[in-house]
């Protein structure tokens, strides 16, 4: 099996969960 390492250039050491809804629901069909 392979192993790879990724490094982000973002300087913050705390992952930001702010890009995702806190209590998401499923998309409704229109």
């Amino acid at each position: 099996s392979e192993t790879t390492t990724g490094t982000s250039s973002n300087s913050s050491q705390s992952t930001s969960n702010s890009g995702l809804a806190p209590n998401p629901t499923n998309a409704t069909t229109k």
């Epitope: 982000s8 050491q13 890009g19 995702l20 809804a21 806190p22 629901t25 998309a27």
Partner: antibody, heavy 115, light 112 residues
């Protein structure tokens, strides 16, 4: 320095199983919502699964295409998130990225499902 | 599922010139808390994606202010005020309002 190190990828036959692992360092892992996202030439970027933190009771979410076949889990004491992939299909082939809520990303590990 | 449609598919820009990418969602991405969970990601050749912008217009740490995001509801735009050589790659919009999270098909930025 934030690093996400993925491992476990490889070649597997249709119907087979594989377990991916992602080790995080340099980040407050226990607070992170962790996702697996895959990428293929056919489907582009495709979200697979997510596990939230203790404050969210480690709730999990899955894409419909993997529900019942894949299981996401985490070990906060080790700073690791896992993706157990069962009953694999050829369409599961791709590069699997571990990401902290789309913020930090690993370099990806390749999974090929083929006979 | 929410469909994210990006235009153009590709664009070629001279260094120092501006660039603009459009992203349209099939439903409003406005969440009940008043926030809109629209992200922009950059993927340089041979690299993994990197988030540039979250919640429509908020820049991630370390991202140059040449990048900016705008829009609301279903129509969003990523702008680069002055393109630099390091900006080449594929840009994706991604929505985090409704499950499943979905991505646009990408816009390839080439340097003239």
């Amino acid at each position: 320095e934030v690093k996400f190190e993925e491992s476990g990828g490889g070649l597997v036959q249709p119907g087979g199983s594989i377990k991916l692992s992602c080790a995080a360092s340099g980040v407050t892992f226990s607070e992170a919502w962790m996702d697996w996202v895959r990428q293929s030439p056919e489907k582009g970027l495709e979200w697979v699964a997510e596990i939230r933190d203790k404050t969210k009771n480690y709730v999990t979410y899955y894409a419909e295409s993997v529900k019942g076949r894949f299981t996401i889990s985490r070990d906060d004491s080790k700073g690791r998130v896992y993706l157990q992939m069962n009953n694999l299909r050829t369409e599961d082939t791709g590069i699997y990225y571990c990401t902290g809520a789309m913020d930090y990303w690993g370099q990806g590990t390749s999974v090929t499902v083929s006979s | 599922d929410i469909v994210m449609t990006q235009t153009p598919l590709s664009l070629s820009v001279t260094i120092g010139q501006p660039a603009s990418i459009s992203c349209k969602s099939s439903q409003s991405l406005l969440y009940s808390n008043g926030k809109t969970y629209l992200n922009w990601l950059q993927q340089r050749p041979g690299q993994s994606p990197k988030r540039l912008i979250y919640q429509v217009s908020k820049l991630d740490p370390g991202i140059p202010d040449r990048f900016s995001g705008s829009g609301s509801e279903t129509d969003f735009t990523l702008k680069i005020s002055r393109v630099e050589a390091e900006d080449l790659g594929i840009y994706y919009c991604m929505q985090g309002t409704y499950l499943p999270w979905t991505f646009g098909g990408g816009t390839k930025l080439e340097i003239k």
